[in-house]
């Protein structure tokens, strides 16, 4: 039999951050290889990662075609050294992944504070707009391009001499906050998609940036 001693994959898991999307599964192969197929609910199956001994497959190129679609993947198990033969009619064992909707489920990557500039008692803090592999008209889109106003940033800011964190929010990538003159402040940002109701609605915090370091600029 063409599928003797092959084990079906299990624990199929989507790992996705800022739309970079990898399907992972188990077990580590012993005398077998895998091929992955992906499709939308209404589309045809497309094969990827042919006869791989890996237990992961990068499906980013497929899901970025329409990040609002819902995708399903499946992993086929074949004997090691398997060569596709036209005469084979036996379907190899396979396992389906959970459904995955990138727009709703991709994790938000850790944001970065690009710069901050103080003018008197105002500070303008700018969050770096991350590029994704999502394209429109042959142009790569930023996270802001993809999510639009669905994506907000929360800024935590505090006096270097104090522990209490004030907050500000924006649906752009810029904050303009009031600060006390002569005080140094530290900043950290968090990306949030408030419309999500699941565990992936917030990113991890950006690295903390403080005034008096190279990212900032001060003008009277």
């Amino acid at each position: 039999s063409g599928t003797t001693n092959t084990v079906a994959a299990y624990n199929l898991t989507w790992k996705s951050t800022n739309f970079k999307t990898i399907l992972e599964w188990e077990p580590k192969p012993i005398n077998q290889v895998y091929t992955v197929q992906i499709s939308t609910k209404s589309g045809d199956w497309k094969s990827k990662c042919f006869y791989t001994a890996d237990t992961e497959c990068d499906l980013t190129d497929e899901i970025v075609k329409d990040v609002k679609q819902t995708y399903l993947a499946r992993v086929f198990s074949y004997p090691a050294g398997h060569v596709e033969s036209t005469g084979s009619t036996e379907e190899p064992p396979y396992e389906n992944s959970p459904e995955f909707t990138p727009y709703l489920e991709t994790n938000l990557g850790q944001p970065t504070i690009q710069s901050f500039e103080q003018v008197g008692t105002k500070v303008n803090v700018t969050v770096q707009d991350e590029w994704t592999l999502v394209r429109r008209n042959d142009t790569f889109l930023s996270l802001r391009d993809v999510f639009g106003k669905d994506l907000i940033y929360t800024l935590y800011y505090w006096k270097s001499s104090s522990s209490g964190k004030k907050t500000a929010k924006t649906n752009t990538n810029e904050f303009l906050i009031d600060v006390d003159k002569g005080e140094n402040y530290c900043f950290s940002v968090q990306a949030v998609i408030p419309s999500r109701r699941t565990a992936n609605r917030k990113s991890t915090d950006s690295p903390v940036e403080c005034m008096g370091h190279e990212k900032g600029e001060s003008r009277e």
Epitope: K165, T167, A199, T204
Partner: antibody, heavy 120, light 107 residues
Framework: EVQLVESGGGLVQPGGSLRLSCAAS????????IHWVRQAPGKGLEWVGY????????YYADSVKGRFTISADTSKNTAYLQMNSLRAEDTAVYYC?????????????WGQGTLVTVSS | DIQMTQSPSSLSASVGDRVTITCRAS??????VAWYQQKPGKAPKLLIY???FLYSGVPSRFSGSRSGTDFTLTISSLQPEDFATYYC?????????FGQGTKVEIK
């Protein structure tokens, strides 16, 4: 169903301590901000402080700074308000409320409140 | 801190009346203002967010508006269940602050 349930209120002497709990269900506190708000008898609403359980960040009203501490245990899906050096003016119903951290970010769900009475 | 000055502190009205409550912010808060309704012995309930957006499940007789730093809550036709205390709140900056409250009583 989203629910917040406060507990731990009671009668305490001036200078004493009390710890209030805010148990959340129907959502994970790690993904939201939790605020504490109080209301003295016959008075208006006064914001006490907040915690972002995902990073532990907090901020307090000047009236409680240095005396009150907000914490969270994400494994228990519960936020806490530790109140020390209590004064008569801290007598109030204490509410916890959820902040969805949206741009408009109002407090969309509130607990039923727990009464704290500071009296000798 | 931003002050929210709410007026009137109380008002008497009849069922069917149009009721208007105002809040003035001491500085710009954009549209980051919410309105809450509170009944005796109960927690506040969100009515309006972002100055003018009706929260889900809230009857359409409630509406909110903004003019600069002035914010208004309007009840177009007061119902028996609307007799309560109403609070505005700004959440533009930390700390978030509440108005003093307006008690709507039966005339």
């Amino acid at each position: 169903e989203v629910q917040l349930v406060e507990s731990g209120g009671g009668l305490v002497q001036p200078g004493g301590s009390l710890r209030l709990s805010c148990a959340a269900s129907g959502f994970t506190i790690n993904n939201y901000i939790i605020h504490w708000v109080r209301q003295a008898p016959g008075k208006g609403l006064e914001w006490v402080g907040y915690i972002d359980p995902s990073n532990g960040y907090t901020y307090y009203a000047d009236s409680v700074k240095g005396r009150f501490t907000i914490s969270a245990d994400t494994s228990k899906n519960t936020a806490y308000l530790q109140m020390n050096s209590l004064r008569a003016e801290d007598t109030a119903v204490y509410y916890c409320a959820r902040d969805p951290q949206s741009l408009s970010s109002p407090f969309d769900y509130w607990g039923q409140g727990t009464l704290v009475t500071v009296s000798s | 801190d931003i002050q929210m000055t709410q007026s009137p502190s109380s008002l008497s009205a009849s069922v069917g009346d149009r009721v208007t409550i105002t809040c003035r912010a001491s500085q710009d808060v954009n549209t980051a203002v919410a309105w809450y309704q509170q009944k005796p012995g109960k927690a506040p309930k969100l009515l309006i967010y972002s100055a003018s957006f009706l929260y889900s499940g809230v009857p359409s007789r409630f509406s909110g508006s903004r003019s600069g730093t002035d914010f208004t809550l309007t009840i177009s036709s007061l119902q028996p269940e609307d007799f309560a205390t109403y609070y505005c709140q700004q959440h533009y900056t930390t700390p978030p602050t509440f108005g003093q409250g307006t008690k709507v009583e039966i005339k």
